[in-house]
Interface confidence: low
């Protein structure tokens, strides 16, 4: 059998196989050692007994989408049946005091591979026995502690495979410079040691995406905005836009990134090299926000040009083709077009990312202030409590609810939270009454809210001791 017979149904075209060469990966035309690595079809009854105590689940994730040329990383995590875990030696053991359907196990081991390997490798001092090989016959790499790695992972995509020895979790990174744009499929098959052979325990597949567009996400934050995810914001308060570029492999770390904003409110274009920008809308309505991100990213060098004329190229061309890797010695002459002829030279290509959102601007509560605090008359049964009226004003729209959070003087440990609907007239003046149990200093966070906004003010108040003999305190 060949790898492609074992690993996947999808057969990439000859073009795909030729143009998607992954560094360090092998062609799935290679032979698969079925004696050491048996192949079971989906639904084969043997899967049921491939693992003691249940089925192992493999979870495959990636940090897709990947900008073409960057690295994409795949992670596989094995999830064992209940009460099982991998120990420091790579053996699979039962967790202490964990009871599963079979009850508590007397044997601490599910699989004691340490004992197996000591038995089976005794015949040959090198440890390079005929069974310590991958499905294509390549020997296991002898990293320190490799004997504790008891799972074999075979990754398969684009007509190629990659083999890895590991524990219950592995990661593999692939450079996408030669990967066709668009969605691709990654499949992983996992085997476990079984004496001098291997047993399949899990198969998993996941889609990943390679793109020539910079993956851009924008977070929007505005003080007093009640729900930052609904793309509704408040008039007359700045909105902070923060651009997040999805670049987990740091491919663009040394790139100059430009951000070009159009806020849709006739304020023109705003160009910046900063990933954050503030903008205040002064009118209500619906606006179309557009962002274009431009980065000079490492990319393929252009084909060799015709022999250059003696005159020097324009600076802009020189800039476009300048060497990305500053450690690479420059070309012998001063003609930057020669860059394309230098082997392994990295050139730059402009990559773009786009973000568009429709945002709604509405009236909201812009500010809230406590203008007065008044001690209130308290009836005799509650000598320990103090009632305090907070007189509050606000600016902007009229609130429909009030919340008070009473906490310790550091404002960190919440003692009491009360929220209630309110009715306020156009003057936006209201009284909020709250109870304080006992004397001392309290931090009071008071928020006024309506459908779209939530405005906060804080104050520290000092509640005096009550004299039990005269429990009544008159309000001012």
């Amino acid at each position: 059998k060949r790898f492609h017979d074992v690993l996947g149904n999808e057969r990439p075209s000859a073009y795909m196989r030729e143009h998607n060469q992954l560094n360090g990966w092998s062609s799935d035309e290679n032979d698969w050692n079925e004696k050491l690595y048996p192949v079971w079809k989906r639904g084969d009854m043997r899967w049921k007994n491939s693992w003691k105590g249940g089925r192992v689940q493999a979870v495959l994730t990636s940090d897709s989408p990947a900008l073409v040329g960057s690295n994409i990383t795949f992670a596989v995590n094995l999830i064992f049946p209940r009460c099982q875990k991998e120990d420091a030696n790579g053996n699979i053991v039962y967790e202490k005091n964990c009871r599963n359907e079979a009850g508590l196990s007397a044997d601490p081991y599910v699989y004691n591979w340490t004992a197996w390997s000591e038995d089976s490798d005794g015949e040959n001092g090198t440890g390079q026995s005929h069974h310590n090989v991958f499905p294509d016959g390549k020997p296991f790499p002898h990293h320190p502690g490799w004997r504790r790695w008891n799972f074999i992972y075979v990754f398969h995509t684009l007509g190629q495979y990659f083999q890895k020895l590991g524990r219950c979790s592995v990661r593999v990174s692939v450079n996408t410079a030669n990967v066709t744009l668009g969605p691709q499929l990654m499949e992983v098959t996992v085997y476990r040691r079984h004496g001098r052979a291997y047993v399949p325990i899990a198969q998993v597949k996941d889609v990943y995406v390679v793109t020539d567009q910079i993956p851009v996400f924008v977070t929007m934050f505005q003080k007093n905005d009640r729900n930052s995810s609904d793309e509704t914001f408040l008039k007359d308060l700045p909105i902070m836009f923060d651009v997040l570029i999805h670049d987990p492999s740091h491919f663009l770390n040394y790139s100059t990134i430009n951000y070009k904003w159009s806020f849709g409110d006739n304020t023109g274009l705003f160009v910046s090299t900063n990933h954050t920008v503030n903008h205040t809308y002064v009118l209500n309505g619906t606006f179309s926000l557009n962002l274009t991100v431009k980065a000079a990213a490492p990319g393929p060098c252009p084909p060799p040009p015709p022999p250059p004329r003696p005159s020097k190229p324009t600076p802009s061309l020189a800039t476009t083709l300048k060497s990305y890797d500053s450690n690479t010695p420059g070309p012998a002459g001063d003609n930057p077009l020669e860059l394309s002829r230098i082997p392994d030279e990295n050139c730059q290509i402009n990559r773009y990312g786009h973000f568009q959102a429709t945002i709604t601007i509405v009236e909201g509560i812009l500010e809230v202030n406590i203008i007065q605090m008044t001690d209130v008359l308290m009836p005799v049964p509650w000598p320990e409590s103090s009632l305090i009226d907070f007189v509050v004003t606000c600016q902007g729209s009229i609130p429909t609810e009030v919340c008070t959070i009473i906490s310790d003087p550091t404002c960190e440990i919440t003692q009491n939270t009360v929220c209630s609907p309110v009715d306020v007239d156009e003057m936006c003046l209201l009284t909020v009454r709250r109870t304080f149990n006992g004397s001392g200093t309290y931090c009071v966070n008071l928020t006024l809210g309506d459908d779209t906004s939530l405005a906060l003010t804080s104050t520290l108040i000092s509640v005096p001791d009550r004299d039990p003999a005269s429990p009544l305190r008159m309000a001012n």
């Epitope: 009226d389 007189v391 609810e401 919340c403 939270t417 009360v418 929220c419 209630s420 609907p421 309110v422 009715d423 306020v424 007239d425 209201l430 009284t431 909020v432 009454r433």
Partner: antibody, heavy 119, light 111 residues
Framework: QVQLQESGPGLVKPSETLSLTCTVS??????????WSWIRQPPGKGLEWIGY???????TYNPSLKSRVTITRDTSKNQFSLELSSVTAADTAVYYC???????????WGQGTLVTVSS | DIVMTQSPDSLAVSLGERATINCKSS??????????LNWYQQKPGQPPKLLIY???TQGSGVPDRFSGSGSGTDFTLTISSLQAEDVAVYYC?????????FGGGTKVEIK
């Protein structure tokens, strides 16, 4: 101690206007964060909120009765009142006035007064 | 309007036994993570008396045997050990939205 007391005629003719007053003692009806409500309960049935007047004077009515209801207040007497026009037999009920504490719940109720609509 | 539906309509429980009353709202009455749901007890010829507010907070002077639970649209009033004086009609009420609305009531009797 806060107390509420309803007063008004116990019998009203159909198509006429029902008028009730709630006298509050122990607290001013202009004290911040309180609302003063009218709630009714037909004999053997459940409770229905009619409307309330805020400490600030703002009034809110139940939409189902809005066209027929008027709530007013007299801060000098510490009273608030209910008028329900064009009454029918379906308006026969025990009418309660109540205080709504910080918009959470009705914590103080009057004893209620039975108003019968009959000719 | 938010419609409040109580079940059962009536309930007969032996003295000392547990009584459970359910209240369901037509839409969520949670606000800031707090259930704006109150429970009242009404005895014949008397006005309702507050038992529980904010879904689970006991009103002043309410015996510990009364407790409330629930969130969103489903709430429960529990009387852990029924006493003779607990014979009454119990109402739930939402205060999240205007108009405040009450459930139809559950009559609790001694079996």
């Amino acid at each position: 101690q806060v107390q509420l007391q309803e007063s008004g005629p116990g019998l009203v003719k159909p198509s006429e206007t029902l008028s009730l007053t709630c006298t509050v003692s122990g607290i001013s009806i202009t004290t911040g964060n309180y609302r003063w409500s009218w709630i009714r309960q037909p004999p053997g049935k459940g409770l229905e909120w009619i409307g309330y007047i805020y400490y600030s004077g703002t009034i809110t009515y139940n939409p189902s009765l809005k066209s027929r209801v008027t709530i007013t207040r007299d801060t000098s007497k510490n009273q608030f009142s209910l008028e329900l026009s064009s009454v029918t037999a379906a308006d026969t009920a025990v009418y309660y006035c109540a205080r709504d504490l910080t918009h959470w719940y009705f914590d103080v109720w009057g004893q209620g007064t039975l108003v019968t609509v009959s000719s | 309007d938010i419609v409040m539906t109580q079940s059962p309509d009536s309930l007969a429980v032996s003295l000392g036994e547990r009584a459970t009353i359910n209240c369901k709202s037509s839409e969520s009455v949670d606000y800031y993570g707090i259930g704006f749901l109150n429970w009242y007890q009404q005895k014949p010829g008397q006005p309702p008396k507050l038992l529980i507010y904010a879904a689970s907070t006991q009103g002043s002077g309410v015996p510990d045997r009364f407790s409330g639970s629930g969130s969103g649209t489903d709430f429960t009033l529990t009387i852990s050990s029924l006493q003779a004086e607990d014979v009454a009609v119990y109402y739930c009420q939402q205060s999240k939205e205007v108009p405040p609305t009450f459930g139809g009531g559950t009559k609790v009797e001694i079996k």
